[in-house]
């Protein structure tokens, strides 16, 4: 069974997917539609990289321009470097400015939403 | 203003290779995936495949996928393919198309005026 | 992939009068159809977007219609420049289709 086959038999189960599945999922070349990504658990996309949602989406991560405004994405944006989000080749905006250090604070985070950032 | 810029001509002899050009200006090259479309004589458009600037990456309709070969240079902002073994049946017309983002993954908003490509011995 | 299927392939009216195309897809394709213009010599002109959403600068004749997997197009008070052949194309699917073509004449 090849990626594509097996995505479509999982797609119904995929909305509470923890992170490590996905993370699982973006190296077997599956092409997830852009419909199913939007409906992912924003806390299970956050930790993805953009590699790895490059990975998971394959052509359609074309589509992930559209969706920069709406969650997950919106919040997904937030977590990544804009030099890694620049490579999607899509002008997507909102990423940690090069430079930047992210601290994980778990705690600060669940609070404001955002990662705490710490300047050059 | 976008203007994607495509040679008007090419003649290219049987089982050889050809490299189609398509310069990009008045936008930032690389925040946009760059699309080719061909048109057979007297046929409809047909979508070959697009290509991540930023990276690289390419994409291809599978009919294409043996045939077309798609680049880009960053530095000249121009994206480029390569048809290989080319015969009779690659005679068309070759168009270059950039994408407007607003919904979904997006409809073409600009052109190429596009590459006659002429295989003949 | 997406099938688009257009209808007719060719079709000739009077000058002023008003045409109609039609094109269906093969699943649901959420509004997201684009139509062009396509002259001879010339890359195709976006006129519609996301069904009915007219592109700047394109006259109000023009205008398009539908939902689902099935899709029109009209040019109303049809012009001697709008003698082209028109396509839709599918944006629902990273893979684009475009259906046929559609050469207007006048009569």
């Known amino acids: 069974m090849n990626g594509s086959e097996y995505f479509v038999k999982i797609q119904s189960f995929l909305g509470g997917a923890p992170t490590e599945d996905l993370k699982a999922l973006s190296q077997q070349n599956v092409s997830m539609d852009l419909a199913t990504f939007m409906k992912l658990r924003t806390d299970a996309v956050l930790p993805l990289t953009v590699a790895e949602v490059q990975k998971l989406l394959g052509p359609h991560v074309e589509g992930l321009k559209a969706e920069e405004r709406h969650r997950p994405v919106r919040d997904w944006i937030l977590r990544q470097r804009q030099d890694d989000l620049d490579t999607l080749g899509l002008g997507l905006q909102g990423g940690i400015p090069n430079g930047y250090l992210v601290l994980d604070l778990s705690m600060q985070e669940a609070l404001s939403g955002t990662p705490c950032l710490l300047g050059p | 203003q976008v203007q994607l810029q495509q040679p008007g001509t090419e003649l290219v002899k049987p089982g050889a290779s050809v490299k189609l050009s398509c310069k990009a200006s008045g936008y930032t090259f690389t925040n946009y995936w760059m699309h080719w479309v061909k048109q057979r004589p007297g046929q409809g458009l047909e979508w070959i495949g697009n290509?991540?600037?930023?990276?690289?990456?390419?994409y291809y309709n599978e009919r294409f996928r043996s045939k077309a070969t798609l680049t880009v240079d960053k530095s000249s902002s121009t994206a480029y393919m390569q048809l290989s073994s080319l015969t009779s049946e690659d005679s068309a017309v070759y168009y270059c198309?950039?994408?407007?983002?607003?919904?979904?993954?997006?409809?073409?908003?600009?052109w190429g005026q596009g590459t006659t490509l002429t295989v003949s011995s | 992939d997406i099938q688009m299927t257009q209808s007719p392939s060719s079709l000739s009216a009077s000058l002023g009068g008003k045409v109609t195309i039609t094109c269906k897809a093969s699943q649901d394709i959420n509004k997201y159809i684009a139509w062009y213009q396509h002259k001879p010599g010339k890359g195709p002109r976006l006129l519609i977007h996301y069904t009915s959403e007219l592109q700047p600068g394109i006259p109000s004749r023009f205008s398009g219609n539908g939902s689902g997997r099935d899709y029109s197009f009209s040019i109303s008070n049809l012009e001697p420049e709008d003698i082209a052949t028109y396509y839709c194309l599918q944006y629902a699917n990273p893979l684009r289709t475009f259906g046929g073509g559609t050469k207007l004449e006048i009569k």
């Open positions: 198309a950039r994408p407007y983002y607003g919904s979904s993954y997006g409809y073409f908003d600009y």
């Open positions: 290509i991540n600037p930023s990276n690289g990456g390419p």
